[in-house]
């Protein structure tokens, strides 16, 4: 199934690719030590080398199934007719500590498998207990998870996972934290981290909400850990704007959800509307996000330390059409410091007894905040009251770049020698390379300096991932993975073209008269051996 290397256009050498003609690709992860690439697909999990040759394929479907069978037919006979059913990979996570891959599918009510990293041998799947089923929803880009390793030598790993539930709130929580046991056959595998008569490590969409808004669901776009918190970027039906009338127009809102890593009772649950605005246009439909560090220059411009987290996000314009959002989209920047501060202010306000909990989809009643002497600091993880808590004001990001024509679909970023480079995938299969610099002349906070084709005409999917050495970017469409070099300096044939490109990777290597990275240029640190500024071209 491996495809032939294919030309990337222009004078660039062909990019390495992997093609899956039969099965749609859904997720991609890269092992941070080995550089090997794991790809989730419909009915398959693939293991590829760093240069995208196929090493292993593991078959996950089709299976004889019916989503009305609960538990699945493999466990208990079912009165509904069975049919050959695709198993869509919806979550793919590397469990480094246990040397295994977690692959969650849509079949059998949404169970997960563990595969050995070396050879994709199936290590086990959970015992069929009610809480082991995550969700039978087939939409691939709607589930997100964060794997939290247990403390070294002791403690248990856990999985925070969010998923749409397609109205089946009695079966599936929308958000939960699950135990990950060392032994894949352990009966407690995927059990809730905590469960008692009153509370457990899960949130369910109340049946009242689904009665009033049958289409209500929460779609999880991106998740990450930052410090002691787990965050999710979600899209959910906006119950304030959407009429309960099923025939009416649906409006969506993007929310950032936060939980404390060590909060098994989910008392720390907070969600805030999130988005950004440019020139009076609101961008409210989150498409993708990427957690990164800012790079020396950007950190200085933002007043951050270099080791603080920032979040690059892509939003489509407006609040309609979740599945086919408008092409107009924006790349935006958030600092985790600002997000945390906004959330803390809201919690503090509520603990002063001000306002309401403001979470209509979850509470189904307007609960007032209760005044309390508890001290609310940056690390506060909630109590049994004043929770769950909703933000009433949208957390606004800084717009960096607006694409009115192509539509941004995916984002990744990294720090190259102190400068922040963002890669944005588009609807037409291109990768835009963007230099973020808030001190740019003319007030443009970002410069799109290059655009390359990964796969013409096919939208770039969300999992845009850098290789461990930051030399390549893996871009995935439904049918192909493409390895795109982060730079193509060699295409620029003169000093002026090289430095005029504004590619932060590129400089003019005087000794060989080629455009290259600094680390590829001999004696680059000697005077007048490596030009990194357009003015130096004239001097040379």
């Amino acid at each position: 199934e491996a495809g032939l290397p294919r030309a990337g256009g222009g004078s660039q050498p062909p990019f390495r690719t992997f093609s899956a003609s039969d099965w749609g690709l859904t997720h991609l992860v890269v092992h941070e030590q080995t550089g090997e690439v794991y790809v989730g697909a419909v009915n398959r999990i693939y293991k590829l080398s760093g240069n995208l040759t196929l090493l292993r394929a593991h078959v996950t479907g089709p299976v004889e199934d019916n989503e009305k069978c609960y538990p699945p037919p493999s466990v208990q006979s079912c009165p509904h007719g069975l049919g050959s059913t695709d198993n869509v990979n919806k979550l793919l996570l590397l469990d480094y500590a246990a040397n295994r891959l977690l692959a969650c599918g849509s079949a059998s009510q949404g169970i997960c498998q563990f595969l050995r990293l070396d050879d994709l041998f199936k290590l086990g799947e959970p015992h069929h207990r009610k809480e082991h089923y995550l969700s039978s929803v087939q939409e691939a880009g709607s589930m997100a998870g964060v794997l939290i390793a247990g403390p070294p030598g002791q403690g248990q790993a856990k999985l925070f996972v969010g998923t749409p539930i397609d109205g089946k709130s009695e079966y599936f929580p929308t958000l939960s934290s699950r135990r990950l046991m060392a032994n894949e056959e352990d009966a407690d595998m995927f059990g809730f981290v905590y469960q008692d008569e009153f509370v457990s490590s899960q949130l369910k969409i109340p049946s009242d909400t689904l009665s009033k808004f049958p289409a209500f669901d929460i779609y999880y776009v991106y998740s990450f850990r930052s410090e002691q918190f787990v965050y999710y970027l979600t899209l959910q039906l906006d119950t304030q704007l959407t009429s309960p009338d099923a025939a009416g127009e649906h409006f969506f809102t993007s929310k950032i959800v936060r939980l404390c890593v060590d909060d098994p009772k989910f008392y720390s649950y907070v969600e805030f509307p999130i988005g950004c605005e440019q020139a009076g246009v609101e961008y409210r439909l989150v498409q993708d996000a990427y957690l990164s560090r800012p790079g020396r220059a950007l950190a200085h411009q933002l007043g951050l330390a270099e080791d603080e987290d920032v979040l690059f996000t892509v939003f489509a314009q407006g609040q309609k059409n979740r599945v086919k959002p408008p092409k107009e989209s924006a790349l935006c920047l958030f600092t985790l410091r600002a997000i945390k501060e906004k959330i803390k202010e809201r919690i503090q306000s509520c603990y002063r007894g001000e306002g309401k909990l403001s979470l209509p989809w979850l509470l189904n009643k307007e609960l007032g905040c209760i005044n309390s002497p508890l001290q609310i600091d940056d690390d506060f993880c909630g109590q049994d009251f004043n929770q769950p808590l909703g933000g009433t004001v949208t957390i606004e990001g800084t717009p960096l770049f607006v694409d009115k024509d192509d539509g941004l679909t995916a984002v990744a970023a990294y720090d190259y020698r102190g400068r922040t480079v963002v890669f944005a995938g588009t609807r037409s299969g291109r990768i835009r390379k963007i230099l973020v610099d808030l001190s740019n002349p003319g007030g443009r906070p970002a410069l799109a300096y290059e655009s390359v084709v990964a796969q013409e005409g096919s939208p770039i999917l969300r999992d845009l991932v850098l290789s461990p050495n930051h030399q390549y970017l893996y871009a995935m469409t439904e049918k192909q993975v493409t390895r795109v070099p982060v730079e193509s300096c060699v295409q620029y044939t003169s000093c002026e073209l090289c430095l005029g490109s504004r590619d932060p990777h590129c400089g003019w290597c005087v000794l060989h008269s080629i455009c290259s990275r600094r680390d590829a240029c001999e004696r680059a640190d000697e005077p007048q051996r490596f030009a990194a500024d357009l003015l130096q071209c004239v001097q040379l």
């Epitope: 009772k265 007894g353 007032g368 905040c369 209760i370 009251f385």
Partner: antibody, heavy 122, light 107 residues
Framework: QVQLQQSGPGLVKPSQTLSLTCAIS??????????WNWIRQSPSRGLEWLGR?????????DYAVSVKSRITINPDTSKNQFSLQLNSVTPEDTAVYYC????????????WGQGTLVTVSS | SYELTQPPSVAVSPGQTASITCSGH??????ASWYQQKPGQSPVLVIY???KRPSGIPERFSGSNSGNTATLTISGTQAMDEADYYC??????????FGTGTKVTVL
């Protein structure tokens, strides 16, 4: 199973201090998910919440406005108990006094002590 | 200060439904709990978070809360349900308030 066992005198003279203790078994007074309350009941006032103590990284107290100036609720971690002190009592403070546990504002008082009738009389 | 008002008494025939109301300003914006107390005994929690029953409480006890009124409903009332019933909520300044109490008599 959580149990709360109350102890203390049944008769207190006016202007003196009412002191009661509630011993906890099956839970910890330092639990970060419980609070420990004193509630009283009299024919004239019905059930009346007096206050509570709870630990959330440090100790906190909430008191009813009606008794705020003369009440103290203290935890005793070494004995896993908590106590009520009500100063300057009058016959109006005659009531059955209960200790009770709550697990948060929305969970109600799920365990109660057996109650102690305290009479304030000279 | 915040107040919760209940009817002093409710009479019900065995097997019938008894409804006890509890009124307070915007009570629906708070969580209500309900307690049963029999003579000479400590109160027992029968409903918390408006509608939820602790383990061991029969299904015939149910609760609701909206607007300014919380309601405890005992369906298929039995003789053993004869008792005093109290509603309870916390006000926004973290002070606990009990209702005035309702005596339920099973005829």
């Amino acid at each position: 199973q959580v149990q709360l066992q109350q102890s203390g005198p049944g008769l207190v003279k006016p202007s003196q201090t009412l002191s009661l203790t509630c011993a906890i078994s099956g839970d910890s007074v330092s639990s970060n998910s419980a609070a420990w309350n004193w509630i009283r009941q009299s024919p004239s006032r019905g059930l009346e919440w007096l206050g509570r103590t709870y630990y959330r990284s440090k100790w906190y107290n909430d008191y009813a406005v009606s008794v705020k100036s003369r009440i103290t609720i203290n935890p005793d971690t070494s004995k896993n108990q908590f106590s009520l002190q009500l100063n300057s009592v009058t016959p109006e403070d005659t009531a059955v006094y209960y200790c009770a546990r709550d697990r948060g504002y929305s969970y109600g008082f799920d365990y109660w002590g057996q109650g102690t009738l305290v009479t304030v009389s000279s | 200060s915040y107040e919760l008002t209940q009817p002093p008494s409710v009479a019900v025939s065995p097997g019938q439904t008894a409804s006890i109301t509890c009124s307070g300003h915007k009570l629906g914006e708070k969580y209500a709990s309900w307690y049963q107390q029999k003579p000479g005994q400590s109160p027992v929690l029968v409903i918390y978070q408006d509608t939820k029953r602790p383990s061991g409480i029969p299904e015939r006890f149910s609760g609701s809360n909206s607007g300014n009124t919380a309601t405890l409903t005992i369906s298929g009332t039995q003789a053993m349900d004869e008792a005093d019933y109290y509603c309870q909520a916390w006000d926004s300044s973290s002070v606990c308030v009990f209702g005035t109490g309702t005596k339920v008599t099973v005829l």
